[in-house]
Amino acid sequence: DCDIEGKDGKQYESVLMVSIDQLLDSMKEIGSNCLNNEFNFFKRHICDANKEGMFLFRAARKLRQFLKMNSTGDFDLHLLKVSEGTTILLNCTGQVKGRKPAALGEAQPTKSLEENKSLKEQKKLNDLCFLKRLLQEIKTCWNKILMGTKEHSGTTNTVAAYNLTWKSTNFKTILEWEPKPVNQVYTVQISTKSGDWKSKCFYTTDTECDLTDEIVKDVKQTYLARVFSYPAGNVESTGSAGEPLYENSPEFTPYLETNLGQPTIQSFEQVGTKVNVTVEDERTLVRRNNTFLSLRDVFGKDLIYTLYYWKSSSSGKKTAKTNTNEFLIDVDKGENYCFSVQAVIPSRTVNRKSTDSPVECMGQEKGEFRENWVNVISDLKKIEDLIQSMHIDATLYTESDVHPSCKVTAMKCFLLELQVISLESGDASIHDTVENLIILANNSLSSNGNVTESGCKECEELEEKNIKEFLQSFVHIVQMFINTS
Amino acid sequence: DCDIEGKDGKQYESVLMVSIDQLLDSMKEIGSNCLNNEFNFFKRHICDANKEGMFLFRAARKLRQFLKMNSTGDFDLHLLKVSEGTTILLNCTGQVKGRKPAALGEAQPTKSLEENKSLKEQKKLNDLCFLKRLLQEIKTCWNKILMGTKEHITCPPPMSVEHADIWVKSYSLYSRERYICNSGFKRKAGTSSLTECVLNKATNVAHWTTPSLKCIR
């Protein structure tokens, strides 16, 4: 009794593919040095029709050799998952019936090298090149299997992708589209205006494709992507015009269009009546000479920061600007100030601004309940990390400009709405984290006694915002509690 | 009794694919130096119709060879997960039924090398190129299998919620849809408008989950 789909029908995707993709993602950098070796392994073992099981069986076995590489535990864990998961799942899917699998010890050296070098001399990189290719092939082969075994309602009709949308922050760039596939799969291609098409995310059932490693090659180029739709289980079959259906994306110029990520205040230092505030220079995925460039490296003087600052005791804000990552501002002696920064690219006409950084304040003494609030913030960060890989499109009531006299009311709304995230994620660790956070927050709130606030907005009167903005505003209000605890 | 989905129904995506994707992500840079090697493994082992299991079985086994490379522990852990997970999951899916699995010690050398050189001589880069390709092939092959394992089950029309409407874009299994409060009503804070098309394992019948939504004036 082998229910591949299991309880909610996503076993393969949620385990094996996640590991494969994480491995491949961690190997993004590998490739440019691989000298396009033709590995014989892939000549002899091909994920061909009726041979997918055998290919995957061999590839999974091959993967095990890499487990003894001196790599990080995380990487090994994924390799183990892909290798073992493939082997297990193969038994379940029956794709290798009647085949005699290959013996396990055999390796896959390259043709040219095998003629004249001992393996010990071979660069580590070459192993990684092979490993990356092996992972890619395993992924492709699984995709091929999993597309092919779905029962169809007697039709190979495909639907063209639509609503192709670029989602890009600090050059991390993902193409998203609709619809969720039913009996079809997608492959994405990307090119510059003058370049060749490069295929990515082969035969995927996802409705997004990470194109970061393509666009970071030249962020000032304009890119176009297209999404091909294929019938599940019959990727060779084409549309009526003799080629698969596809839809083009809007053009995308990363330098002009990537969203600016939320900045972070790295430090502030007071000397007399001057305070020096430093903004963290965030690393991007853009590379030059084998190093990742920072946001400032990429944008230079095109990027400016706006600082908002105010006395902890009042709400009247002041502002300053810099085209470096440092501000030097005048403050009143003996006063504590709070700071928030925003990144801006003045030369742009859209996507000019980032969201505001979390608020940082001077002289935050550890009050009795400050520790609780600090833990609430770390729980919120944890929730933010956990939901990143999920597609929760909920909008939540969010108070983004909390007046100090309404902070308890606002906090209660945040705590209520947090439960929606818990409900919709269906994830045990999110559920536990939310539960823990609510307990911590309620403990701290009860320490204020029964505060009655009047003239404050009901939760339902607040603006609904996406989860990211909701969590950012939540962090802001917690900072407010920290500053006054 | 092989419940691939595991306890929380996301076993494959959250374990195997996560590892595959993490490995591939860490190998992003690998490729441009790979000189478009045509690895024989992928010529001999193809994730073809009705052969997906064997391909994955071999690919998982092949992955194990990389565990001995001098890479980071993190990388190895993912490799181990992909290799072992594939093996385990293959047993579960029945994709290798009736096949004689390979003996554990056998590796997959390329044609020319196996004739005259030991594996030790092979450049590490080349191995990585191969590994990356192997992971990609395993991932694709799994996708191919797993897309085919569930017949197209759909949900009936969703239940009605007081003062709310729903426009269903897809009745397919695992579709997530939202109710919208009628004009003049707002979602009560703390309630969710989400409903999901899920499968009742006992009856094998799909149904929409009950939303916690309350619409208030």
Epitope: K317, K321, Q342, D401 | -
Partner: antibody, heavy 117, light 107 residues
């Protein structure tokens, strides 16, 4: 093309309030701050404050705190300035302008507010 | 607050003349300075931003220079339409103060 169109002139009695609007078109409203500037008869330009439609943050000159309140309506791409407790010295032309971070590149045509008993 | 001192307050010149107006900041503002022109009954119009950059559509006879605390604005050859009031503004830190203006009149 980019335009900032302000509401018409107003005559008010001392102690009253007035709301001046500034409707923006031809650009992404939330991407640019809206500045407000006063020019009293025969005088120079005085900066009142600005609002960032993206996050709702307002910054005021100390002299206008409590006098001016800046708001926006993102759905109509309109910025508003409310002046309260009007006095004769508030008689002036009030301008809104679009801030490109390094300067004010587009200005409204100005709204004359006259405070007279 | 940063004070902006503009000089001269008024200036008479003829068509074809070269004229320079200066603006002094009470503390360093790097190059966060803009220059505007205003004609009677009209809205101000941006001429120079970031101390030295010519705004779109502004004739090249206008130029700006300086950084830190000392700035100047020059019209290389006065045209009849250039007779107006000119303002500098610092956009470095709030309040974003203007200079008191320089009225340029026909001699």
């Amino acid at each position: 093309q980019i335009q900032l169109v302000q509401s018409g002139g107003e005559v008010k009695k001392p102690g009253a309030s007035v709301r001046v609007s500034c409707k923006a078109s031809g650009y992404s409203f939330t991407d640019y701050n809206v500045y407000w500037v006063r020019q009293s008869p025969g005088k120079g330009l005085e900066w009142i404050g600005y609002i960032d439609p993206y996050n709702g943050i307002t910054i005021y000159d100390q002299n206008f705190k409590g006098k001016a309140t800046l708001t926006v309506d993102k759905s109509t791409s309109t910025a508003y300035m409310e002046l309260s407790s009007l006095r004769s010295e508030d008689t002036a032309v009030y301008f809104c302008a679009r801030d490109v971070t390094t300067a004010l590149d587009f200005w409204g045509q100005g709204t004359t507010v006259t405070v007279s008993s | 607050d940063i004070q902006m001192t503009q000089s001269p307050a008024s200036l008479s010149a003829s068509v074809g003349d070269r004229v320079t107006i200066t603006c002094l900041a009470s503390q360093t503002i790097d190059t966060w300075l803009a220059w505007y022109l205003q004609k009677p009954g009209k809205s101000p119009q941006l001429l120079i931003y970031a101390a030295t950059n010519l705004a779109d559509g502004v004739p090249s006879r206008f130029s700006g220079s300086g950084s830190g605390t000392d700035f100047s604005f020059t019209i290389s050859s006065l045209q009849p339409e250039d007779f107006a009031t000119y303002y500098c503004q610092q956009v470095y830190s709030s309040p974003f103060t203007f200079g008191q203006g320089t009225k340029l009149e026909i001699k």
